[in-house]
């Protein structure tokens, strides 16, 4: 942009150098050149000479008018045609920007990833503003009334060392730019309720050579949280439909989960956990691929009526990927109950 230009005159913008996208804009150029009575004053936008909607106001001043200006940024400058000069003479230049006031930040979420030492808050910023927009995260203790504020662009990590005075907080986000300011809704946060257990990892899988082969998946986490609730989802690599098994886990030892699967098939497994009774899930673990062994006597395999599904799981649910290219985005289709109670109701955010 044109940040430091020696002007021989002035350039100004109405309604201002930063304005709402789609507004009508007038840009004025006033020359103060020595030894020049300009024949013409010219306007340039991004280096290209403008031809239309230019008005000569008086000997020294001209104006260009834009109807519904909708470019996020433009570099304007104006020149004078001085008698006896071969080249045009620069008068002045300005950066101009158009954009939108911010939307109120929405879907504010704060979590503490176990062992991170930070509370991470994220939010939806809404539609693009096209101009510099900052977010001020307010964290107010409900016990001491003290308020801390943090500047951010899209998310914030707040050291838990600075949250020592209290366990309960009110958090909200203020979006600010040159065209306006909006506040999110306030979020009540209890630090003990927002911890996400340390990442769960599937370490290995094996299929036994029994008459009815079973696959054992081994998985672990370094979490110190005692009561953890987990989901493992699995499907063949050719399938779009996931099955989901639920577990109460105790990570003082490696978890083993048994599955009766279709033989000679490549399966993908993923696991995620949350502190029991809390609402924040880990992201799904990295996909773990396992090939089941061949079976000599082939059978017709039906996962939903089959005796081969391990009965000790709490529930097995069926989930379908929206697109084969987006295996992380899942949509709940149905639930099949195996142990007398419905699926947990936490499936809407799978993926």
């Amino acid at each position: 942009g044109i940040t430091s230009i020696n002007c021989s005159g002035d350039m100004w913008v109405e309604p201002g150098e930063i304005f709402q996208m789609g507004m009508n804009v007038s840009i004025y150029c006033q020359e103060a050149l020595k030894h020049c009575r300009p024949r013409n004053l010219y306007f340039y936008k991004n280096g290209f000479k403008e031809e239309f909607d230019i008005t000569r106001i008086n000997r020294t001043t001209a104006r260009i008018w834009y109807k519904g200006f909708s470019e996020p940024h433009a570099y304007m400058h104006c020149t004078a045609e001085c008698p006896g000069h071969f080249q045009e003479t620069l008068i002045c230049g300005k950066d101009i920007s158009s954009g939108h006031p911010p939307d109120a930040p929405s879907n504010l979420t704060c979590v503490i990833y176990e062992y991170s030492g930070n509370m991470t808050c994220t939010w939806n910023t809404g539609k693009p503003t096209y101009i510099d927009t900052k977010y001020i995260v307010h964290v107010k203790s409900l016990e001491t009334e003290e308020e801390q504020q943090y500047l951010a662009s899209s998310y914030v990590k707040i050291s838990t060392d600075s949250l020592q005075g209290s366990r309960k907080y009110l958090v909200w986000v203020q979006a600010v730019n040159s065209l306006g300011m909006e506040n999110s809704q306030q979020l009540h946060v209890h630090l003990d309720d927002i911890v996400i257990p340390s990442a769960s990892i599937i370490s290995r899988a094996e299929t036994t050579n029994d008459t009815v082969p079973k696959t054992i998946v081994y998985w672990k986490s370094k979490t110190m949280i005692e009561k953890v609730f987990c989901e493992m989802r699995y499907k063949t690599t050719t399938n779009q439909t996931w099955s989901v098994k639920e577990f109460d886990a105790n990570f003082t030892y490696v978890q083993q989960s048994e599955f009766y699967l279709e033989p000679d098939s490549k399966y993908v497994f993923q696991v995620r956990c949350q502190e029991t009774g809390k609402r924040n899930w880990q992201p799904w673990s990295s996909p773990f691929v396992h090939q089941t062994s061949q079976e000599t006597g082939k059978r017709n395999w039906q996962p939903w009526s089959s005796p081969f599904v391990h009965q000790t799981s709490q529930t097995v649910s069926q989930v379908t990927a929206k697109s084969s290219h987006e295996p992380q985005k899942m949509e709940m289709l149905s639930a099949t109950i195996f142990r007398g109670h419905p699926a947990s109701g936490n499936h809407q955010d799978i993926g």
């Epitope: 801390q148 943090y150 500047l151």
Partner: nanobody
Framework: QVQLQESGGGSVQAGGSLRLSCAAS????????MRWVRQAPGKGLEWVSG???????IYADSVKGRFTISKDNAKNTLYLQLNSLKTEDTAMYYC??????????GSQGTQVTVSS
Amino acid sequence: QVQLQESGGGSVQAGGSLRLSCAASGFTFRLTAMRWVRQAPGKGLEWVSGIDSRGSTIYADSVKGRFTISKDNAKNTLYLQLNSLKTEDTAMYYCAQGVYGDTYSGSQGTQVTVSS
């Protein structure tokens, strides 16, 4: 209780520089976001700049690229470096708690006068 005391103002020619200070006491300065606001003669209060506890900064468009806000937690002091001053920067300058807002809590302020 919270005490804020501004200093460093003065008279300067257009294009000149000044450094304003704000000495703070009565609260945990290192954990507190701060801001500068100003009031030009006959006008309302105008927010100028803010800084959070980690040093992230934000500026009004009118001062962006010319003013720099900073804080020294060891000295419990907030600063505002004013460069390339313009006549329209003439105002009483106040510091306050919080990153953003066009209010202050009754501190005395420091006068900046820029002449052409």
